[in-house]
């Protein structure tokens, strides 16, 4: 904290301009009026104040707005945003997407800081849901944003917002998250024709149930192995050899390279060796001929 001293003669700031960068911290404290600063916040970012000087300016704004800054000030914080704590940000009411964009721009290209995470949380909670424009903005700045949300938070994403999601936005999502996102994607893309639908839904298929995979196998989609390997094991296990062959099309040959990895390994163990042999890939580990397969889970369900 800068101690209170009188402003030297002739140094009282009449406007926020570059001459202030040559002021010592105590001079800024003594010579810059908080109300003037608030009305000319848009100039601050164009002036190369040191972070120590920005601390002084922040202190002035804190005194002027102890309950939290108004959005007119927040929108123009620029690099001063980097000096805010999550506690400061929790006092704000940010409703404009333009304000959000302006603040995200300051941290562009860097990891999501606690300040940014708090800002996004405040903004999304204020809106009530993660609408398409917000999601568009957030994933543009932070491609991994969607996968940082819990399944509960993802449940508030309306299906219409799914159109904003790019494949790379889902790279770090785990199965629990995809379980929530897949039904939304299915709903969002339901009116598209077969090949276009598959292109859009492909990134979300890690959340698809068996019946949807069976339906896709009837549509000549030629799923690539990378997508197949991300499918839920429990959704892949009931698929027949014929269904997997149709699902993968020419990519079926890739199963050989993945035969030791899930879900391929577990799927092989569930297939008859005879059926696997029809693929001509040399896949081993299926159920030998003449063995009877009892589905105990089915038996339990019946009793």
């Amino acid at each position: 904290e800068v101690e209170k001293t009188a402003c030297p003669s002739g140094k009282k700031a009449r406007e926020i301009d570059e001459s202030l960068i040559f002021y010592k911290k105590w001079e800024l404290e003594a010579c810059v009026d908080a109300a003037l600063l608030a009305t000319q916040m848009d100039r601050v970012n164009a002036i190369p104040f040191t972070y120590e000087q920005l601390d002084v300016l922040k202190h002035k704004l804190d005194e002027l707005y102890p309950q939290g800054y108004p959005e007119s000030v927040i929108q123009h914080l620029g690099y001063l945003f980097l000096k805010m704590s999550p506690e400061d940000i929790r006092k704000w009411n940010v409703t404009s997407l333009e304000t959000l964009k302006a603040l995200l721009e300051v941290n562009k290209g860097h990891e999501m800081s606690p300040q940014v995470a708090t800002l996004i949380d405040r903004f999304v909670k204020g809106r009530g849901q993660l609408d398409k424009d917000t999601l568009d903005t957030l994933t543009a700045f932070y491609p991994g944003y969607l996968c940082s949300l819990s399944p509960e938070e993802l449940s508030s994403v309306p299906p219409s917002s799914i159109w904003a999601v790019r494949p790379q936005d889902l790279d770090t999502c785990d199965p629990r998250q995809l379980d929530v996102l897949y039904p939304k994607a299915r709903l969002a893309f339901q009116n598209m024709n077969g090949s276009e639908y598959f292109v859009k839904i492909q990134s979300f298929l890690g959340g698809a149930p068996t019946e949807d995979l069976k339906a896709l196998s009837q549509q000549n989609v030629s799923m690539d192995l990378a997508t197949f390997m991300k499918l839920r094991t429990d959704a892949v296990l009931p698929l027949t050899v014929a269904e997997v062959q149709k699902l993968l099309g020419p990519h079926v040959e890739g199963l050989k390279a993945e035969e030791r990895h899930r879900p391929v390994r577990d799927w092989i163990l569930r297939q008859r060796q005879d059926d696997l042999d029809t693929l001509g890939l040399g896949l081993q580990g299926g159920i030998p001929n003449g063995y009877l397969v009892l589905d105990l889970s089915m038996q339990e369900a019946l009793s």
């Epitope: 002036i47 190369p48 040191t50 972070y51 120590e52 690099y79 980097l82 000096k83 300051v106 941290n107 290209g109 860097h110 990891e111 800081s113």
Partner: nanobody, 116 residues
Framework: QVQLVESGGGVVQAGGSLRLSCAAS????????MRWYRQAPGTERDLVAV??????YYADAVKGRFTISRDNSKNTLYLQMNSLRAEDTAVYYC???????????WGQGTLVTVSS
């Protein structure tokens, strides 16, 4: 992290010239502004010049005599000092601050002595 190393200081006659260099290494992509400060014996450290994007700023005491510049390809900051005066004698420090971490970094300083 950003590391800064100054060079180019020395003893020069009044009216002479010197060029200081500051080599930056580390996370130089995140640098926001770069500055030259100076500190004469027994005084506070004073801001001399700043480069911020394509804009430059100078303290009144050096305006018209000193020129700050930056070569991004070499990650080097310069201070060209002409018409040097005895009162320019000081330790000159290079400073940079970064986006993201909102941190200040300093070099170790280089001594400039102007003899009259």
């Amino acid at each position: 992290q950003v590391q800064l190393v100054e060079s180019g200081g020395g003893v020069v006659q009044a009216g002479g010239s010197l060029r200081l260099s500051c080599a930056a290494s580390g996370s130089t992509f995140s640098i926001r502004a770069m500055r030259w400060y100076r500190q004469a014996p027994g005084t506070e450290r004073d801001l001399v010049a700043v480069i911020y994007g394509s804009s430059t700023y100078y303290a009144d005491a050096v305006k018209g005599r000193f020129t700050i510049s930056r070569d991004n390809s070499k990650n080097t900051l310069y201070l060209q000092m002409n018409s040097l005066r005895a009162e320019d004698t000081a330790v000159y420090y290079c400073n940079a601050d970064t986006i993201g971490t909102a941190r200040d970094y300093w070099g170790q300083g280089t001594l400039v002595t102007v003899s009259s």
